[in-house]
Amino acid sequence: EQAPGTSPCSRGSSWSADLDKCMDCASCRARPHSDFCLGCAAAPPAPFRL
């Protein structure tokens, strides 16, 4: 489990507790409700949902 305030993830990705790995913030455009999107500074807005 990740300690609060720490991240093993590189820039542009965020830790997913659901998947137990770093995930791409870019994927928050299509899946904004993913748990890791909260850790992305700003999920890019989607012009439309995939």
């Epitope: 659901d18 137990d20 791409d24 870019a26 994927s27 455009r29 299509a30 899946r31």
Partner: antibody, heavy 119, light 111 residues
């Protein structure tokens, strides 16, 4: 290790039916969108179907070329995805791959299975 | 649908040289933050293998010889220095919308 093990395929006559199966292991299957992509010399790599998550009542998407003829389904309890193909045409001939994506890119692919539609 | 046009269709490169493959989208596939183009390598008798995501981010285990760039409608895959094992067909794919489409592929051969 992620693995997508496919089964099904073979020779079928035009107008016939075939069901493909794909069993996944090594990742959290229920969180991933599952897809079928086919490949032929004529069409190259062609995405044909996707099924998303239980939390959204398993929405599906299809390529226009297969809409109304093909049905994608999944069974999360079996880590499996299926493609039921009806009213098959010669142009459906090709190698069929199952592939998973979280949202954007197809990071894992099955080994492929060949479908030949011919009389 | 967004059409991806790859060029050249085939490419012959000497060992150790640079291979450059282009992928052009029929509409922009980028936001201000990310580009929704991905690259794959396929060898005979094998499924495509995922190489690069979001235009420029290598998958884990992909050698640094592979690099991607571009935004908007124009994208490039570079391989340098080319090695014998790089003989394959390379495809781009977009995830901007449904349907996700692939380019027709670029066949890379060694001289």
């Amino acid at each position: 290790e992620v693995k997508l093990q496919q089964s099904g395929g073979g020779l079928v006559q035009p107008g016939g039916s075939m069901k493909l199966s794909c069993v996944a292991s090594g990742f959290t299957f229920s969180y991933y969108w599952m897809n079928w992509v086919r490949q032929s010399p004529e069409q190259g790599l062609e995405w044909i179907a996707e099924i998303r998550l239980q939390s959204n009542d398993y929405p599906t998407h299809y390529a226009e070329s297969v809409k109304g003829r093909f049905t994608i389904s999944r069974d999360d309890s079996k880590n499996s995805v299926y493609l039921q193909m009806n009213n098959l045409r010669p142009e459906d001939t090709g190698i069929y791959y199952c592939a998973c994506r979280y949202a954007d890119y197809f990071d894992h692919w099955g080994q492929g299975t060949t479908l030949t539609v011919s009389s | 649908d967004t059409v991806l046009t790859q060029s050249p269709a085939s490419l012959v490169v000497s060992l150790g040289q640079r291979a450059t493959i282009s992928c052009r989208a029929s509409q922009s596939v980028s936001t201000s933050d990310y580009s929704y183009i991905h690259w794959y390598q396929q060898k005979p008798g094998q499924p495509p293998k995922f190489l690069i995501k979001y235009a420029s981010n290598r998958d884990s285990g992909v050698p640094a010889r592979f690099s991607g760039s571009g935004s908007g409608t124009d994208f490039t895959l570079n391989i340098h220095p080319v090695e014998e094992d790089d003989t394959a067909i390379y495809y781009c794919q977009h995830s901007w919308e449904i349907p996700p489409t692939f380019g027709a592929g670029t066949k890379l051969e060694l001289q």
